[in-house]
């Protein structure tokens, strides 16, 4: 027979049975539940019918309260008790202890450099204005629309123009101050400003005087000019530009002191401000001497283009130029205006790509460097700034010259492209602190190769190996030249190559290691005790 | 008003060097490009090269080996230089201004000079 | 290079008649972006320099006469003289200007039946 039975909770003390001492009246008591909604502290519960069953469950029904508290007090519990408690503790205190000795023994995260922003990405130069847009269109308002694609490129400055009045070789009809209406007006500039900061775009105006003539520094009024660049600075600084660039500085006269003089109210500003210096000289002894005086000077120059191409000059350029420049912070480019093409052939931008945004230092770029842009390819056009290829519509002159996998949208719809490259290396450059900031060691691979490990602390790390030969080659990586802190594992995981073919993700021998002509290869491998 | 005038020795002996001057007025070379182009007797026009408004150059591949196009703005002249002559060089050399809009450059001549003949021959 | 073909490579009309001639050219000179024809037509009268009588395929430079109407596809051309005048005769020329290097065709020589 069925009955509800209803149970004051309140009166459930341990002085009563417990219910686990209760006879259960369903098999294994699956037959209780909820059997009505909750009603002022009461539950129903549904008790089964089958008496049979209850009465079968009801044989054994455990220690009573009294007997357990009997045995509970036994000297063998007790002793039992004390053991347990005892474990647990030397347990726990041996635990404690052992994360001591490891915290203690561990090796100390190596403390991060202070990085400003040019030291986390690329630079990105646009020195005619009117050949980026394209012709009739080359102003700051349409510049303000092409912010988007800079932030697609990942760079984290833009140096911009020179933009100010410059009537050629005149410098009365110079001025810094004020921006040259073809190009818009101040509150045009200012405009670009606002956008450029939302998107964590800098911008650095470039200053260089005479743009347009002969002598970018008009040679005899040396100290007129300079106290205009000095006017400029303060006046520019406080449009809030993020930084500034001189070019030609090997036609200052005196440069170093007018460098440091200026370098002073950069930095008095703010430190968070940058100085760069553009000359066209490939010697490193004059590169020194510019840098000597100015120790946070961002210095662009020929240096590297007169690398012939070749692996083991490349590599003895670039260790020569780090060995004497110490820690200071570095620049590569391989001029300081104009594009990869003028230097390179085609076969060698995707080897120069990989290579610049992969040195220690801030890569920069002329615009259309991530392109391929080629002036020698676009008859009529100027060799220093050639008409951006946007798309096939951006060279109307001779539409011949043009094919679409020329042009940024070309380019953008091809994943195996320069443009696509570019993107990758420039978005691993900004985010892996083995790039950011990384040591650099490089080392022998072979007659034709240059190859280098960047790695920080514990750190994923990087292995580069290039290529700059027109022939296939063994890569024979010659640990041997490496610290201890920088030592080759027997496989790494293939990033990303210049060529395509390779299967990206793959594990390579390190041992058994082929490139192909002109190929360049960026391997990570984990850091290993 | 736009006039271009084309200027050189009329004999050249074989393997000897060509040099020829394009005088210019009524625009400026540092505006428009000014192209080269001959016409052997009773046939047809071939282009040889250009000297563009910038300064660069381009040139017929076939005769790129021996060509040289160079210029000086100041004297509003244009120059042609060709070495190694043979006498199937005997042509009229002209030189015309290449199209300029103020924006595109578009490759069709608007202004032509009178015309040089050269003849090659010991 | 672009290869451009002329024919017929002579033709003798009369004056008043109307006279056709063809130009090809191996590939198409039409730009899709902006609708035009990279063509232009000369003429060279016995003992002078070529003069641009058209441009853009069919746009008379100032100047030259209505009687000359040039057209085409983008690869098929033709220069139209309506009404053959005797100061008419001449040497003929179309040149591409689509690609680089520019490219003559061997022109249409117009002489008197």
């Known amino acids: 027979m069925s009955q509800d039975t209803e149970v004051d909770m309140k009166e459930v003390e341990l002085n009563e049975l417990e219910p686990e001492k209760q006879p259960m009246n369903a098999a294994s008591g699956a037959a209780m539940s909820l059997a009505g909604a909750e009603k002022n502290g009461l539950v129903k519960i549904k008790v089964a019918e089958d008496e049979a069953e209850a009465a079968a469950a009801a044989k054994f029904t455990g220690l009573s309260k009294e007997e357990l508290l009997k045995v509970a007090g036994s000297p063998g519990w007790v002793r039992t008790r004390w053991a347990l408690l005892l474990l647990f503790w030397l347990g726990w205190l041996g635990m404690l202890a052992g994360a001591v000795v490891i915290i203690v023994r561990a090796p100390r995260c190596r403390e991060l450099p202070a990085q400003k922003w040019w030291h986390t990405g690329a630079l990105y130069r646009i020195g005619d204005l009117q050949a980026f847009q394209g012709h009739g269109a080359g102003n700051l308002a349409g510049l303000k629309g092409r912010l988007d694609y800079l932030s697609s490129l990942k760079v984290k400055g833009l140096v911009l123009g020179p933009i100010h009045k410059n009537q050629k070789d005149d410098v009365a009809q110079t001025d810094l101050l004020q921006i040259d209406p073809n190009f818009g007006s101040k509150e045009d500039f200012d405009s670009l400003l606002q956008s450029a900061k939302k998107k964590s775009i800098r911008v650095i105006l470039d200053l260089t005087p005479n743009y347009r003539g002969e002598n970018s520094w008009f040679s005899t009024q040396v100290d007129t000019v300079a106290t205009k660049v000095k006017d400029a600075l303060e006046f520019w600084l406080q449009a809030g530009v993020d930084g500034f660039q001189v070019r030609d500085i090997e036609n200052l006269k005196d440069a170093s002191s007018f460098l440091a003089e200026w370098q002073n109210i950069t930095k008095g500003f703010s430190e968070d401000r940058l100085l760069i210096a553009g000359t066209n000289s490939s010697d490193l002894q004059q590169i020194l001497s510019l840098l000597e005086s100015n120790k946070d000077l961002l210095l662009t120059s020929s240096y590297l283009s007169d690398s012939g191409s070749t692996g083991e000059h490349t590599k003895s350029l670039v260790t020569q130029y780090l060995n004497a420049t110490g820690n200071r912070w570095c620049s590569w480019s391989l001029s300081q205006a104009r594009l990869l093409t003028s230097f390179l052939p085609a076969q060698l931008l995707r080897l120069y790509q990989l290579m610049l945004f992969t040195l220690p230092g801030t890569p920069v770029f002329s615009y259309g460097d991530e392109i391929g842009l080629d002036a020698a390819a676009l008859p009529g056009q100027p060799m220093e700034a050639p008409v951006m290829l946007w798309d096939e519509s951006s060279f109307p002159d001779i539409p011949g010259a043009v094919s679409a996998n020329m042009t940024v949208k070309g380019q953008s719809e091809d994943p195996g492209s320069l443009l696509s490259l570019f993107r990758r290396l420039s978005d691993q450059r900004s985010k892996e602190r083995s790039l950011l900031h990384g040591d650099f060691h490089a080392f022998s691979a072979g007659p034709g190769l240059f190859s280098y490990i960047r790695h920080w602390d514990q750190n994923e790390r990087f292995l580069v190996v290039l290529n700059f030969g027109d022939v296939g080659l063994s890569a024979g990586l010659q640990a041997s030249d490496l610290p201890a802190s920088a030592s080759l594992p027997a496989k790494a995981d293939l990033l990303l190559s210049t060529q395509p073919g390779r299967e990206e993700g793959s594990p390579l021998e390190l041992e058994r290691l082929k490139l192909e002509p002109h190929e360049g290869l960026l391997l990570r491998f984990p850091y290993a005790a | 008003q736009v006039q271009l005038k084309e200027s050189g020795p009329g004999l050249v002996q074989p393997s000897q060097t060509l040099s020829l001057t394009c005088t210019v007025s009524g625009f400026s070379l540092s505006s428009y490009g000014v192209i080269w182009v001959r016409q052997p007797p009773g046939k047809g026009l071939e282009w040889m090269g250009i000297?563009?408004?910038?300064?660069?150059?381009n040139y017929n591949s076939a005769l790129k080996s021996r060509l040289s196009i160079s210029r000086d703005t100041s004297k509003s002249q244009v120059y042609l230089k060709m070495n190694s002559l043979q006498t199937e060089d005997t042509a009229t050399y002209y030189c015309a201004r290449h199209y300029y809009d103020g924006t595109h450059y578009y490759g069709y001549f608007d202004y032509w000079g009178q015309g040089v003949m050269v003849t090659v021959s010991s | 290079d672009t290869v451009m073909t002329q024919t017929p490579s002579s033709q003798a009309v009369s004056a008043g008649e109307k006279v056709t001639m063809s130009c090809k050219s191996s590939?198409?000179?039409?730009?899709?972006?902006?609708?035009?024809?990279?063509l232009a037509w000369y003429q060279q009268k016995p003992g002078q320099s070529p003069k641009l009588l058209i441009y853009?395929?069919?746009t008379r430079e100032s100047g030259v006469p209505d009687r000359f109407i040039g057209s085409g596809s983008g690869t098929d051309f033709t220069l139209t003289i309506s009404s053959v005048q005797a100061e008419d005769l001449a040497v003929y020329y179309c040149?591409?200007?689509?690609?680089?290097?520019?490219?003559f065709g061997a022109g249409t020589k117009l002489e008197l039946k």
């Open positions: 040149q591409q200007y689509y690609n680089f290097p520019y490219t």
């Open positions: 853009w395929a069919s």
């Open positions: 590939q198409s000179l039409l730009y899709s972006e902006n609708k035009k024809k990279y």
């Open positions: 000297i563009w408004a910038n300064g660069n150059t």
